[in-house]
């Protein structure tokens, strides 16, 4: 059988390396070997390239070396497949090397902002030795923040008589690390060189790009004073690298500036301790260039109705997100502020804050929670300089069995009944929420008997017991990963009844 | 046997066409560039023009440039030569001869030189501009 | 275009004496690209050396060729009767090919 015709001949010119080309069908099932003609010198010279040895048949690709390799020009390649049955030519095909040269990439040596102008990197680079001296050079440069992992990518070209192998980069973050990396390829050729090696680079810092701002509010002690726990953080947005010296505060009763208070400080919350009224708060942070804009807060009168707009709330799981959803019969709210922390029996550890807008949902990344704790999770609607009331509802990310059962005890031990009582889990030991408890209970040498109640119950009378009987019991605690049995206890039925 | 035979000569006026033809036979034609040389009797050669194996032009004698066209029919194993605007001093026996193939001259590994040469030459075909 | 100069025009010798002929081309010409054939009255030209010093197939070893550059020589070293004939060079290095005028050696 005849080969197969070579077909999809596919070439590239390394550029002042070989002249290399690809065929179809890469095997062949009898032996073939391959013979490539070419002309080059605008066809005035003739050559070929052949896998006609024992280490090359059935390669479907070969190479012309210097010093035949000329530039600029037009070969005319054909490969012939042979094997011991015959020849198959394959269509002759043109190529023009300035459209299929590929160059070494260049080499960027320095990305540097450049003083007193804002948000730009200015990138500079070796032109590859191994390109024409005399051709454009088109550059693909692709930049993206450190901690990114999607790439930008911005065109351009650079004559030869350019020399200056520099490019501005603007329209970045101030105070940001950038990674760069660039590739480039004759202007008219359709092969890219490959990317350079990656060189990082930092705008200049500017004052701080501002700051979000929320609050906590307390009940008021026993003097009226309301404890005020402000606490912000860098606006989103805001440089990675952006660190500020410090903080000033200043806040007053509503139309009553002659009682403005300030205050500095380094931290990132604050308590203040406020009367009965409408107070307005301003925050802003500072560096050795500047301040950040304003950041406002208006914490409402202590009898003050807030509005309420959420009518439900659902949290639920995706594979790597915590989602929330909410509804709220007002359109105009577009902000909403949501606060999560980890529902402990003591006081809260963490408490985190994040806002929302021009959306109803908000998601978190599930590995930025911790599996079995329940977390409670408030979303608050914010209409301007106004806070809505919050709705609230609890999440786990990974729920678990719990770490410990009910402690348990029987009581009112009659003739043929008992009741027992259970107290609560902890919290800290549920590692789920509980759906139900079962209580298993069985007679010395009898059949076991269980009963599941939901898990608002806490006590449970047992009936139709025998009477002078011992019985040994314990209370499953369940939640959607599987149960945890309480201690066991034992009791033993009476045999008269006592009134 | 490996033959050229040439064809098409004859005798016309300054101004005047002819188109000249080569029949190849013995060898694998579109393997071979070939080329058109003449001779005046008692004159040394000159080489007029030649076509490489894919049909691409190699190329004319700068006395013949723009009047003489080379081309070639691998499916009838034929080489052409169109002559026009004849003048005096193209009268001469025009030979066809086969370039050197694609072989040989291997310089290692898988890549071979083509070595140039006219390895195998037809007997002639006479053309004379005369008025 | 390459002007290929032969010398001497003609080399008159005697059976079994070297003759020695001369290429000298008007500019470099890689030495790949660099022919010589021979001619006798009324024959086609026949090949002797290609790539300046490769005898063609068929061609005795009195025949030899070298050079590089812009000169290049065709030596036999014992002419017989057969050698003596036109003998001429020609360059494929650029276009247009070009052959020398040719040397004519004949018997003294």
């Known amino acids: 059988v005849l080969p197969a015709k070579p077909e999809n001949i596919s070439c590239i010119f390394y550029y002042e390396e070989n002249f290399t080309c690809t065929w179809s069908p890469e095997k062949e099932a009898s032996y073939t070997w391959y013979k490539v003609k070419r002309t080059y010198s605008y066809g005035y010279k003739s050559d070929i390239c052949s896998t006609d040895n024992s280490t090359r048949g059935n390669h479907a690709s070969c190479s012309f070396l210097p010093p035949t390799i000329t530039n600029p020009d037009n070969y005319t390649i054909q490969v012939e497949a042979q094997n011991a049955d015959g020849i198959m030519k394959s269509d002759i095909t043109y190529w023009n090397l300035d459209a299929i040269m590929k160059i070494e990439p260049p080499e960027i040596f320095s990305v540097k902002s450049v003083l007193g102008i804002k948000r730009m990197l200015q990138i500079k680079w070796i032109r590859p030795v191994l390109a024409p001296h005399s051709s454009t050079l088109k550059y693909t440069l692709r930049f993206r923040t450190i901690n990114s992992a999607y790439w930008m990518e911005v065109n351009f070209t650079k004559e030869d008589i350019d020399r200056d192998e520099t490019y501005n980069l603007t329209e970045l973050q101030a105070f940001t690390e950038y990674v760069m990396t660039l590739r480039c390829a004759p202007a008219e050729s359709m092969f890219w060189s490959g990317w350079s090696q990656e060189k990082v680079g930092t705008t200049e810092e500017e004052a701080p790009y501002g700051l979000d701002l929320w609050r906590v509010l307390k009940p008021a002690m026993v003097d009226g004073r309301r404890p005020v726990q402000l606490m912000w953080k860098k606006a989103t947005g805001a440089p990675v690298l952006e660190k500020a010296l410090g903080y000033n505060i200043w806040y007053f009763p509503e139309n009553n500036t002659n009682l403005t208070e300030t205050v500095n400080t380094t931290n990132q919350t604050h308590e203040l301790y406020l009367g009965g009224k409408t107070y307005w708060v301003y925050v802003v942070s500072y560096n050795s260039l500047g301040e950040s804009p304003v950041a406002t807060l208006r914490i409402p009168a202590l009898n003050e109705k807030t509005f309420q707009c959420i009518e439900a709330m659902q949290a639920c799981l995706t594979q790597d997100q915590l989602v929330v959803e909410w509804q709220s019969s007002a359109p105009e709210v577009d902000t909403w502020m949501v606060e999560w922390f980890p529902d402990v029996d003591s006081e809260p550890s963490s408490f985190s804050w994040e806002s929302v807008s021009q959306a109803r949902n908000w998601t978190i990344q599930k590995d930025e929670l911790k599996p079995l704790w329940c977390y409670n999770i408030s979303v608050y609607p914010v209409l301007r300089d106004r806070v809505g009331q919050p709705y609230s509802t609890q999440a786990y990310v990974q729920e678990g069995i719990p770490s410990a059962g009910p402690v348990t005890q029987a009581d009112s031990i009659g003739v043929k009944t008992v009741t027992i009582t259970w107290k609560e889990i902890p919290k800290s030991k549920r590692n789920g929420f509980i759906k139900n408890y079962t209580i298993f209970y069985q007679a010395e040498d009898g059949k076991e008997f269980s009963k599941t109640v939901n898990s608002n119950i806490l006590q449970y009378r047992l009936e139709s017991l025998t009477r002078r009987t011992s019985y040994s019991l314990q209370v499953m605690a369940s939640t959607n990963a599987g149960g945890t049995n309480g201690t066991k206890i034992n009791f033993k039925t009476l045999s008269i009844s006592v009134l | 046997e490996v033959q050229l035979v040439e064809s098409g000569g004859g005798v016309v006026r300054p101004g005047g066409s002819l188109r000249l033809s080569c029949a190849a036979s013995g060898f694998t034609f579109d393997d071979y560039g070939m080329s058109w040389v003449r001779q005046i009797p008692g004159r040394g050669l000159e080489w007029v023009s030649g076509i490489n194996w894919a049909g691409g032009t190699i190329g004319y004698a700068d006395s013949v440039k723009g009047r003489f066209t080379v081309s070639r029919d691998d499916a009838n194993n034929s080489l052409y030569l169109q002559m026009n605007s004849l003048r005096a001093e193209d009268t001469a026996l025009y030979l066809c001869?086969?370039?050197?193939?694609?072989?040989?001259?291997?310089?290692?590994?898988?890549?071979?030189?083509?070595?140039?040469?006219?390895?195998?030459w037809g007997k002639g075909t006479t053309v004379t501009v005369s008025s | 275009e390459i002007v290929l100069t032969q010398s001497p025009g003609t080399l008159s010798l005697s059976p079994g004496e070297r003759a020695t002929l001369s290429c000298r081309a008007s500019q470099s010409v890689s030495s790949r690209y660099l022919v010589w054939y021979q001619q006798k009255p009324g024959q086609a030209p026949r090949l002797l050396i290609y790539?300046?010093?490769s005898r063609a197939t068929g061609i005795p070893d009195r025949f030899s060729g070298s050079g590089s550059g812009t000169d290049f020589t065709l030596t036999i070293s014992r002419l017989e009767p057969e050698d003596f004939a036109v003998y001429y060079c020609q360059q494929y290095d650029n276009s247009p090919r070009t052959f020398g005028q040719g040397t004519k050696v004949e018997i003294k």
């Open positions: 790539g300046t010093s």
């Open positions: 001869a086969r370039e050197s193939p694609l072989r040989l001259g291997d310089l290692g590994g898988d890549y071979f030189y083509y070595y140039y040469y006219m390895d195998v």
